[in-house]
């Protein structure tokens, strides 16, 4: 007959390393008499015998986790008790190891040159994987611009064209290596003009070729603007090579002009644009007239469309960079200011401003603008818009104001030619001829000149006269 013997654990538990989905076994060999009852705990919580994830063999001396999960990590203890002496315990750790796994792989990226690009690469694993990157077939070297972040992501500051290519991240630990799929980094470059068109001074009727070269990723498109509008005549030839677009505009020159090359490319929903301009001048024009640099062309704007005569030629001043655009912008601004004036003044002022900014033009060898006749200018100032002008007297700025705030591009009446001196040297305002007939009340403004200076103005209805010395300042 055997003597009772308290349990002794002859094989203490050891630390067990196991990969996810692998088998993990703890052994707790016990010597005792009678045979002990052996129970197992994980993190001090009893493991139930009927839990199918576990196998308990050899009277409890072998505990096996049949398929290890992340959550099985912890401290496992066996407790042996046979009623003789005290219970004995031995503990060991289960360290769940994990081959590297890329949980957030990098994705294809399009980025604009000069910006910052981040390619994600989030990993899991135990031991914690180290992350490196491959570009093309070579290991990517970190530098002042390129860094692998703690998270594993690749950060590229100030992205350059040469950063474009195929990338993949590599996660590595002692248990293995994981590779992401190849992803593409595309570097987009804002449109940039490499070769601007050159200005030309040519004779009337010459052919001129303007050349504009631009680069960008994606390859830009090139459009041409003539004096602020789309080119209406001429032929365009384009060629593309190695992300460079070359555009040639051939023109038959009958008038001077400002030609703008506009290179545009698209980056997602946004566009980038680069511009370069060249002037084409006609030699005889510039020689014979230094003061009046400009050209005659049909008015193609919107603001004065209803005011100016249909198909009339108007003068565009080439001292502006984009004459047609610039003059249209001036009139547009003035138009907004006129919203504040009286219904009597407004149409008259509009007629004055449109005809002043877009003066009638005689083409000839030297394009000559025809100013408004002084009498019509004074009619607007002292008749139709007297109240508005009076309110502005004493101000330091020249022009019509709204609330004393905004300047309007109005002529200085006294400096304009009189229709009595040379009726062909100035422009009449037909609107005023028609409207003045219907005016029944006028502002009381004292003047030293007879009313006869205002064309066809009935003397009985006017209480003011025109003073040639009256300036608009």
């Amino acid at each position: 007959e055997k003597l009772p013997k308290a349990p002794v654990i002859t094989t203490p538990l050891e630390t067990v390393d196991a990969l996810v989905e692998e088998v993990a076994t703890f052994m707790c060999a016990v010597e005792s008499y009678p045979q002990p009852e052996i129970s197992w705990t994980r993190n001090k919580i009893l493991i139930k015998l009927f839990d199918t994830r576990y196998s308990i063999r050899e009277n409890g001396q072998l505990l096996t986790i049949l398929s290890v999960e992340d959550s099985d990590d912890g401290i496992y203890c066996c407790i042996a008790n046979n009623g003789v002496g005290g219970a004995v315990e031995s503990c060991g750790a289960l360290q769940v190891k994990m081959k590297p796994k890329i949980t957030r792989p990098p994705i294809n990226v399009k980025i604009i040159e000069g910006l910052k690009a981040v390619l994600p690469c989030t990993t899991m694993g135990n031991p914690k994987p180290s992350v490196s990157w491959i570009k093309g077939d070579n290991a990517l070297r970190e530098n002042s611009r390129i860094a692998v972040l703690e998270s594993g992501s690749l950060r590229i500051h100030n992205v350059q064209k040469e950063d474009a290519g195929q990338y993949r991240c590599v996660a590595k630990n002692s248990l293995g290596t994981a590779y992401s799929k190849l992803v593409k980094l595309e570097v987009e470059v804002f449109a940039r003009i490499l070769r601007a068109p050159e200005s030309h001074n040519v004779t009337f009727g010459s052919f001129v070729t303007l050349r504009c070269t631009a680069i960008g990723i994606p390859v830009p498109t090139i459009s041409w603007i003539e004096n602020g509008n789309a080119v209406s005549s001429g032929s365009i030839q384009e060629s593309v090579k190695d992300r460079v677009i070359d555009s040639r505009l051939q023109l038959f020159i009958t008038k001077p002009g400002l030609y703008t090359c506009i290179a545009t490319n698209k980056h997602g929903e946004k566009f980038s644009t680069a511009k370069a301009a060249a002037t084409v001048s006609i030699a005889e024009w510039s020689k014979s007239q230094k003061d009046s640099q400009g050209y005659c062309a049909q008015y193609r704007g919107e603001v004065c469309d209803a005011v100016l005569a249909k198909d009339a030629l108007v003068f565009f001043n080439t001292s502006y960079r984009d004459p047609e655009d610039a003059q249209e912008l001036l009139i547009h601004t003035a138009w907004n200011e006129l919203k504040a004036v009286s219904p009597l003044c407004r149409p008259a002022a509009e007629a004055l401003l449109c005809n002043h900014l877009f003066q009638e033009c005689s083409p000839g060898v030297v394009p000559t603008p025809m100013p408004i006749c002084r009498e019509y200018c004074l009619a607007v100032k002292e008749l139709f818009c007297a109240k508005e002008w009076q309110a502005m007297e004493g101000k330091a700025h020249r022009g019509l104001y709204r609330s004393g705030m905004h300047l309007l591009p109005v002529p200085e009446c006294s400096k304009l030619p009189s229709m009595h001196r040379d009726p062909t040297a100035c422009t009449r305002l037909p609107y005023l001829d028609y409207k003045k007939e219907n005016i029944t009340t006028f502002p009381s403004i004292t003047s030293s000149r007879p009313s006869a200076d205002i064309p066809n103005l009935p003397a009985s209805t006017s209480s003011f006269a025109v003073s040639p010395a009256y300036s608009m300042t």
Epitope: D17, M27, R57, T64, L66
Partner: antibody
Framework: EVQLVESGGGLVKPGGSLRLSCAAS????????MDWVRQAPGKGLEWVSS????????YYADSVRGRFTISRDNAKNSLYLQMNSLRAEDTAVYYC??????????????WGQGTLVTVSS | DIQMTQSPSSLSASVGDRVTITCRAS??????VNWYQQKPGKAPKLLIY???TLQSGVPSRFSGSGSGTDFTLTISSLQPEDFATYYC?????????FGQGTKLEIK
């Protein structure tokens, strides 16, 4: 002296059944895990099934699970393997073996002489 | 299941040679590996258990080593009676598995 003697082998048609027995002697049968291991002609060893000392746990190889049943009778010092739905690939010499717990897992320290099972039509 | 891969599958050697057979587990199995010898028409015989412990009655020219996934059985000086087939086995999982065997033949 420890002895394990298998019996019950023979020729059986595919789909048929057979019951193997293993008589143990020379040791306290009820204290040991017992296993069945088989060996197809000219092939290697293949573990088949295992049963705990008091029948508290039972395991099967994937290839036999659902068709074979292991059991023991500690009073008779006997181990059994009930084989149903037999297939040609079950043809083998079947050994019973005693499992011995050591400092690192169990090992088979004693084996029977084996019994041949032939499944053929 | 845990796979056990033995190499080589066959080996020719002469009496007195030192022979090494290796066994690799598909996952860590601690030291829960045993080695058996089998001669034609006979039951297998336990040589080594727990990776390196010599079974009682087995000659000391047999030795085992290894832990984790890689294990070796070494016969320091081959004797005529050692020509047989050798198997490794893991008992780390309750679903035990054997290696495919290494046949040791006389050169």
């Amino acid at each position: 002296e420890v002895q394990l003697v298998e019996s019950g082998g023979g020729l059986v048609k595919p789909g048929g059944s057979l019951r193997l027995s293993c008589a143990a002697s020379g040791f306290t049968f009820s204290s040991y895990t017992m296993d069945w291991v088989r060996q197809a002609p000219g092939k290697g060893l293949e573990w088949v099934s295992s049963i705990g000392s008091n029948g508290d746990y039972i395991y099967y190889a994937d290839s036999v699970r659902g068709r074979f049943t292991i059991s023991r009778d500690n009073a008779k010092n006997s181990l059994y393997l009930q084989m149903n739905s037999l297939r040609a690939e079950d043809t083998a010499v079947y050994y019973c073996a005693r499992g011995q717990l050591a400092v690192a897992g169990t090992h088979f320290d004693y084996w029977g002489q084996g019994t041949l099972v032939t499944v053929s039509s | 299941d845990i796979q056990m891969t033995q190499s080589p599958s066959s080996l020719s050697a002469s009496v007195g040679d030192r022979v090494t057979i290796t066994c690799r587990a598909s996952q860590k199995v601690n030291k829960y590996v045993n080695w058996y010898q089998q001669k034609p028409g006979k039951a297998p015989k336990l040589l080594i258990y727990a990776a390196s412990t010599l079974q009682s009655g087995v000659p000391s020219r047999f030795s085992g080593s290894g832990s984790g996934t890689d294990f070796t059985l070494t016969i320091s000086s081959l004797q005529p009676e050692d020509f047989a087939t050798y198997y490794c086995q893991q008992s780390y999982s309750p679903l035990s598995t054997f290696g495919q065997g290494t046949k040791l033949e006389i050169k």
